[in-house]
């Protein structure tokens, strides 16, 4: 599930990881676009074991997942802008 938030007023990620997490172990992905008090895009991943990690947006594996989710979202009806969930 992918969520896009536009409401954060500060950065949430202190450090970012580029360590690969297969999508089968990902529960949820939250994207905070840059702006609103944070100068960078942030990607937060909730794993199936309940742990949470900030992921480097430049990591190739997360870009592949994002691209796949974008493709899937383009074939489903739109949902509210503030919180987009893409299965």
């Amino acid at each position: 599930v992918l969520e896009v938030y536009y409401t954060h007023l500060r950065c949430r990620c202190v450090q970012e990881s580029s360590v690969f997490i297969p999508r089968r172990f990902i529960d949820r992905i939250q994207i905070s676009p840059r702006g609103n008090g944070c100068p960078r895009k942030e990607i937060i991943v909730w794993k199936k074991n309940k742990s949470v990690v900030c992921v480097d947006p430049q990591a190739e594996w997360i870009q592949r997942i994002m691209e796949m989710l974008r493709k899937k979202s383009s074939s489903t009806p739109p949902v509210p802008v503030f919180k987009r969930k893409i299965p």
Epitope: F20, I21, P22, R24, K48, N49, W61, P87
Partner: antibody, heavy 123, light 106 residues
Framework: EVQLVESGGGLVKPGGSLKLSCAAS????????MSWVRQTPEKRLEWVAT????????YYPDNVKGRFTISRDNAKNNLYLQMSHLKSEDTAMYYC????????????????WGQGTSVTVSS | DIQMTQSPSSLSASLGGKVTITCKAS??????IAWYQHKPGKGPRLLIH???TLQPGIPSRFSGSGSGRDYSFSISNLEPEDFATYYC????????FGGGTKLEIK
Amino acid sequence: EVQLVESGGGLVKPGGSLKLSCAASGFTFSSYAMSWVRQTPEKRLEWVATISDGGSDAYYPDNVKGRFTISRDNAKNNLYLQMSHLKSEDTAMYYCARDYYGSGYEDSPMDYWGQGTSVTVSS
Amino acid sequence: DIQMTQSPSSLSASLGGKVTITCKASQDINKYIAWYQHKPGKGPRLLIHYTSTLQPGIPSRFSGSGSGRDYSFSISNLEPEDFATYYCLQYDNLYTFGGGTKLEIK
């Protein structure tokens, strides 16, 4: 040649504990996630646990969560499965398997498997 | 949890023939399906991953296809060593195996 050799199986009473081991060779063990999968007497395959390449992340299905613990020793090229509070439904052949490449980005499944070690839970 | 319904549970076929096994997922698994061959006394052997990608060293007699919830696996020109039990595995959301298909010589 990739080799995975399981050991530690046996007969154990319900409520008891057992620790399985898997010795890996023929590949860079510390670069791969590893998994345990079991085959029940009815010949069904069930995923049991997965651990990341560095050992920091572990994942379990609900039916073993809190009872089983997967761990690894990258210095010894060994994978472990500590099983406690065992039930009759845990009776199975237990296989260790090499999982995804931790430094990559390909979502590949388990590719090499051992020959298994048998666990029987019975009073 | 995702369920995988594999069929048939058993089938018999002749040498040189062709067989097809199907797996239906309880939800879209985005082509993240693998197929394994399992023989007694050995560990399962990965044949195909990501629906249709053959593992190195696996002959092209083996093939896979599908999308969404529906997937199939075929073996053509059956050889004696092909008679075994076959399992599908979804790895889109944790792991779930199909119930297996035992392939026997007719």
